[in-house]
Amino acid sequence: LQDLCSNCPAGTFCDNNRSQICSPCPPNSFSSAGGQRTCDICRQCKGVFKTRKECSSTSNAECDCISGYHCLGAECSMCEQDCKQGQELTKKGCKDCCFGTFNDQKRGICRPWTNCSLDGKSVLVNGTKERDVVCGPSPADLSPGASSATPPAPAREPGHSPQ
């Protein structure tokens, strides 16, 4: 005996109560594939969630997070509070990064500044809570007498002003 349910398209369900008739999904429900025996209830984007895409008879709603929060997990299953740059989220809320660490985003944890000396380089720009250090040439490159990649500027003749 052929299963008539396999003929039911997305957006409908196979209603066993009505001799396997394909019935449309009611409002606030959907079926994303054919041959379904139920319609799934649409996801509700409430509270810290806001609707990014409305539910339709063939696809679930998609949620985003309201301002001040960001999505976590598959399909934005959670919303996590934003912090400012230079902070990280702890159980007690947003806390400033400790000295020697930085966070240049509104999410995530504070990460240690780059240790320039591990690459044999020197610190060109100091790190802050919001920014990593900028590593420059190695100390050896900066020592007197070291060859420079840029040629010296030409000497001006005395008594001539620059053009």
């Epitope: 369900f13 209603d15 066993n16 019935s23 999904c25 429900s29 025996r37 139920t38």
Partner: nanobody, 126 residues
Framework: EVQLVETGGGLIQPGGSLRLSCAAS????????MSWVRQAPGKGLEWVSV???????YYADSVKGRFTISRDNSKNTLYLQMNSLRAEDTAVYYC????????????????????RGQGTTVTVSS
């Protein structure tokens, strides 16, 4: 005996309003998921609106902003207020008790009507 009886249909001009009632007996409307569906001449069943046990309401796009589903718990009655009626709203309107999987106010899936009334006819014509 579980029963649903719809009333309030009739002939109405385009732009007019009607209120359909659905009196339930043998069960409590407020603790069930209830809906209005309609069947236009020569067409299949079309969903109109659903009200969940927690009072959440949902509508088909074709009636959104014009129709309102509600219930009166003391009268054990379901209502459908229909405003700005159009010729395409002409149909037999049925109220129904729905079957959902899931507990309490948080259903996860719908799997069909379990009780349906005999229907009331709404004709929108000038």
């Amino acid at each position: 005996e579980v029963q649903l009886v719809e009333t309030g249909g009739g002939l109405i001009q385009p732009g007019g309003s009607l209120r359909l009632s659905c009196a339930a007996s043998g069960f409590t409307v407020s603790s069930n998921y209830m809906s209005w569906v309609r069947q236009a001449p020569g067409k299949g069943l079309e969903w109109v609106s659903v009200i969940y046990s927690d009072g959440s309401t949902y509508y088909a796009d074709s009636v959104k902003g014009r129709f309102t589903i509600s219930r009166d718990n003391s009268k054990n009655t379901l209502y459908l207020q229909m405003n700005s009626l159009r010729a395409e709203d002409t149909a037999v309107y049925y109220c129904a008790r729905d079957r959902y999987y899931g507990s309490g106010n948080y259903p996860t899936a719908y799997y069909g009507m379990d009780v349906r009334g005999q229907g009331t006819t709404v004709t929108v014509s000038s």
